[in-house]
């Protein structure tokens, strides 16, 4: 049960993924691929980093716009189309034997509504965090990182809602 992220056609999609470099600045290779995480590496790689920087992108629409050097390897897909829908794998290749962190997230791309009424704050927040706001539940344990956002305070929600609105994305747990 992957966490689902929703974006409208033509907008940017934001798929969160992060790790804590230990020690700080000690970066590890990361890959993003289309399709659930396989046994090793990523299938259908769309973006790959090494210990220093992004070293492989299959398209100019894929970006790491967060603070990569602090472990924010969230993927931004610009100008999404319906074909971008599907499961994506974020794999953090922590050195060691079968030590990788694997995160599967699901992107749902929808056609924009014909008429979009000005959203109220409540509607915006509910679309961004439906389960969190209505039930207080978190997503399933295996999708806590990077997908769901436990213990979010109001300031964080305002910030996150603005980020999501900027990217054209909303979030829901599957």
């Amino acid at each position: 049960s992957e966490v689902e992220y929703i974006a409208e056609v033509g907008q940017n999609a934001y798929l969160p993924c992060s790790y804590t470099p230990a020690p700080p600045g000690n970066l590890v290779p990361v890959c993003w691929g289309k399709g659930a995480c396989p046994v090793f590496d990523c299938s259908n790689v769309v973006l790959r980093t090494d210990n220093r920087d992004v070293n492989d992108r299959t398209s100019g629409r894929y970006w790491l716009k967060g603070d990569f050097h602090k472990g924010d390897v969230s993927l931004t897909i610009e100008n999404v189309t319906l074909a971008d829908s599907g499961v994506y794998c974020c794999r953090i290749q922590i050195p060691g034997i079968m030590n990788d962190e694997k995160h599967n997230v699901k992107l749902v791309v929808i056609k924009p509504a014909k008429v979009t009424p000005a959203p109220t704050l409540q509607r915006d927040l509910t679309s961004a965090f439906p389960r969190m706001l209505t039930t207080g539940e978190h997503g399933p344990a295996e999708t806590q990182t990077p997908g769901s956002l436990p213990d979010v305070n109001l300031t964080q929600i305002f910030t996150l809602t603005n980020e999501l609105r900027d990217s054209g994305a909303t979030i829901r747990t599957a």
């Epitope: 590890v28 396989p38 046994v39 590496d41 790959r48």
Partner: antibody
Framework: EVQLVESGGGLVQPRGSLRLSCAAS????????MSWVRQAPGKGLEWVSA????????YYADSVKGRFTISRDNSKNTLYLQMNSLRAEDTAVYYC?????????????WGQGTLVTVSS | EIVLTQSPGTLSLSPGERATLSCRAS??????LAWYQQKPGQAPRLLIY???SRATGIPDRFSGSGSGTDFTLTISRLEPEDFAVYYC?????????FGGGTKVEIK
């Protein structure tokens, strides 16, 4: 043209050690995960181990975990398999295999194989 | 681990005939399945990956289908060079596993 050439096989006694090498050419070696796959005489294929392009992440079948160590030297375009505590059931042809394009966990190129025989 | 069961174990056919090989997984592997051909004394050769994508240089008489647990490799018209052993391999769940193989022999 992609080429994978294994070496280092031979006859070894039980509980002995052997180191296999695989020299790669014709592709950007450091960009691809690599694997070792073996085939006992007259039997099917068995995946043994894999290593990420950077060499930092390694993966093993339960049958060899703790006894075999996979490694790579990207400056030499070479893959290695250090095999310790060998058993009779490790007797097989060992193939070096390149991971598929875009990270696929299938094998689009294989070496010719090197035979490892464990016997007293 | 995921067990791949290939059937039949041996397929006896004549050149020009159609061959249908089956691979069944003990649990879903999505579309993470590959097919290989192996001839005596040679290394395996990749035919199909991601269940239905043909590898570079593979003739279009080879096709793959299926998802989840049931997969099929079809050779539309057998050529003399197609008589060999065929293996399926899954990469959806650790460890990677191969099927036991199907031998396609000349009738």
């Amino acid at each position: 043209e992609v080429q994978l050439v294994e070496s280092g096989g031979g006859l070894v006694q039980p509980r002995g050690s052997l180191r296999l090498s695989c020299a790669a050419s014709g592709f950007t070696f450091s960009s691809y995960a690599m694997s070792w796959v073996r085939q006992a005489p007259g039997k099917g294929l068995e995946w043994v181990s894999a290593i990420s392009g950077s060499g930092g992440s390694t993966y093993y079948a339960d049958s060899v975990k703790g006894r075999f160590t996979i490694s790579r030297d990207n400056s030499k375009n070479t893959l290695y398999l250090q095999m310790n505590s060998l058993r009779a059931e490790d007797t097989a042809v060992y193939y070096c295999a390149k991971g598929g394009d875009y990270g696929g966990n299938y094998f689009d190129y294989w070496g010719q194989g090197t035979l490892v025989t464990v016997s007293s | 681990e995921i067990v791949l069961t290939q059937s039949p174990g041996t397929l006896s056919l004549s050149p020009g005939e159609r061959a249908t090989l089956s691979c069944r997984a003990s649990q879903s592997v999505s579309s993470y399945l590959a097919w290989y051909q192996q001839k005596p004394g040679q290394a395996p050769r990749l035919l199909i990956y991601d269940a239905s994508s043909r590898a570079t240089g593979i003739p279009d008489r080879f096709s793959g289908s299926g998802s989840g647990t049931d997969f099929t490799l079809t050779i539309s018209r057998l050529e003399p060079e197609d008589f060999a052993v065929y293996y399926c391999q899954q990469y959806g769940s650790s460890p990677l596993t191969f099927g036991g193989g199907t031998k396609v022999e000349i009738k």
